[in-house]
Amino acid sequence: IWELKKDVYVVELDWYPDAPGEMVVLTCDTPEEDGITWTLDQSSEVLGSGKTLTIQVKEFGDAGQYTCHKGGEVLSHSLLLLHKKEDGIWSTDILKDQKEPKNKTFLRCEAKNYSGRFTCWWLTTISTDLTFSVKSSRGSSDPQGVTCGAATLSAERVRGDNKEYEYSVECQEDSACPAAEESLPIEVMVDAVHKLKYENYTSSFFIRDIIKPDPPKNLQLKPLKNSRQVEVSWEYPDTWSTPHSYFSLTFCVQVQGKSKREKKDRVFTDKTSATVICRKNASISVRAQDRYYSSSWSEWASVPCS
């Protein structure tokens, strides 16, 4: 058993039929010695008396809020949560496996630049009685500070008969050095509690590996005289690291017809302009990627040829 936060404890249980469970001793936080009784949740049934209560925790029915009382007055509470281990593996019932980029991916994280700021998100089908707490650090043995905000519900989607909920959190490395070579990964830890079930999820990454620039901005077309060609121009996104001479992007320019089946013309360039042929009813799209490190491409910025 360990303390998650004040008066909240996690009991780690091997979860199999007829498992013996864990013996837990609860101590009433009071100077009183006599006349103390214990109850669980809203029940008025007295579970025991005395300053300590010894219980065998085997299942969810044994978890919950234990309260010690004296003469009708509440003295203290202890909330017991369960963390299930099945076949040697901690349960992952609360979050959905996003399966990208690989199986057992519960947390996904992205950064728009090298500032040390990043966003992580996760999915669940659970809509109520759910709390998340996020901690992060650079390295684990001698951790350097990363500050995370509160997780918030960022999207709700319908998947068949069920809804799916996306939560996200923003974190910022306290002493980020954008130009430095990373040697220790960022660690992100999410504590998830649904009712009386505790689970934890972790992700480890280098900022350079989760970079995904915003799309290029101010995408414009300039027709060239006496030609079907146009000059496409754009700018670095505002959120990208500066100076651009050091934090450089490369770009992919694509001409796409109305039909998805039509052949796409693609041009790769390090410049912020390109000359392409604009077909009728086509659109021109541009996306960006770190020039020197193959992390994710940005989403497309698009304009119609017309």
Epitope: E59, F60, G61, T125, S127, T128, D129, H194
Partner: antibody, heavy 116, light 108 residues
Framework: SVEESGGRLVTPGTPLTLTCAVS????????MIWVRQAPGEGLEWIGI?????NTYYATWVKGRFTISKTSTTVDLKMISPTTEDTATYFC??????????????WGPGTLVTVSS | FELTQTPSSVEAAVEGTVTIKCQAS??????LSWYQQKPGQPPKLLIY???KLATGVPSRFSGSGSGTQFTLTIGDLECADAATYYC???????????FGGGTEVVVV
């Protein structure tokens, strides 16, 4: 205690509001549920309203009902009832432990008959 | 999400024992309650958290199970136990909520 009212005979398409009046506890502490039971059938949950006022509906509801509350009542509005909505409608109070809860205080029910 | 109750009807003698099963289509941990309903009356809570007896309910009623399989057992049957019994999952309103189809208990 909780007690439902407002059930009556209505023609199809006529909106109807059922009211659940509560006493002896505060709606700001408990989840409330509306459940219905067609004649000779089982229990079917319609929706719940949490202590903070958030509403959650069964997937089949699809905008046919809305739940709201005041400090002492919980309303179920039937937007455009059909004959399939003929049932006894129950209001019940949760235990206070959770939003998705079990229910330990039930009203006697109010009968809604939808017929032309 | 589905809660399947079996059997739909059962007949048993006074002082006998009845077992009703409730199966969830996905794990709901121990978030299951049982209700008794008599004709013309609202449901009455018997069991919550799969196995905890509600206030004032005789110990002849007991609940067990977790995950997807749950059981309500009524021992030492009395004529007053003739009723319909419903299980209810309260895991989450989006991801596992609702009532089983009911089991009618006839006491002879």
């Amino acid at each position: 205690s909780v007690e439902e009212s407002g059930g009556r005979l209505v023609t199809p398409g006529t909106p109807l509001t059922l009211t659940c009046a509560v006493s002896g506890f505060s709606l700001s502490d408990y989840t409330m549920i509306w459940v219905r039971q067609a004649p000779g059938e089982g229990l079917e949950w319609i929706g719940i309203i949490s202590s903070s006022g958030n509403t959650y509906y069964a997937t089949w509801v699809k905008g046919r009902f809305t739940i709201s509350k005041t400090s002492t009542t919980v309303d179920l509005k039937m937007i455009s009832p059909t004959t399939e909505d003929t049932a006894t409608y129950f209001c019940a109070r949760g235990s206070g432990a959770y939003i998705s809860d079990y229910f330990n205080v039930w009203g006697p029910g109010t009968l809604v008959t939808v017929s032309s | 999400f589905e809660l399947t109750q079996t059997p739909s009807s059962v007949e048993a003698a006074v002082e006998g024992t009845v077992t009703i099963k409730c199966q969830a289509s996905q794990s709901i941990d121990s978030w299951l309650s049982w209700y008794q309903q008599k004709p013309g009356q609202p449901p009455k809570l018997l069991i919550y958290a799969a196995s905890k007896l509600a206030t004032g309910v005789p110990s002849r009623f007991s609940g067990s199970g977790s995950g997807t399989q749950f059981t309500l057992t009524i021992g030492d049957l009395e004529c007053a136990d003739a009723a319909t019994y419903y299980c209810q999952s309260y895991y989450d309103v989006n991801a596992g909520y609702g009532f089983g189809g009911g089991t009618e208990v006839v006491v002879v």
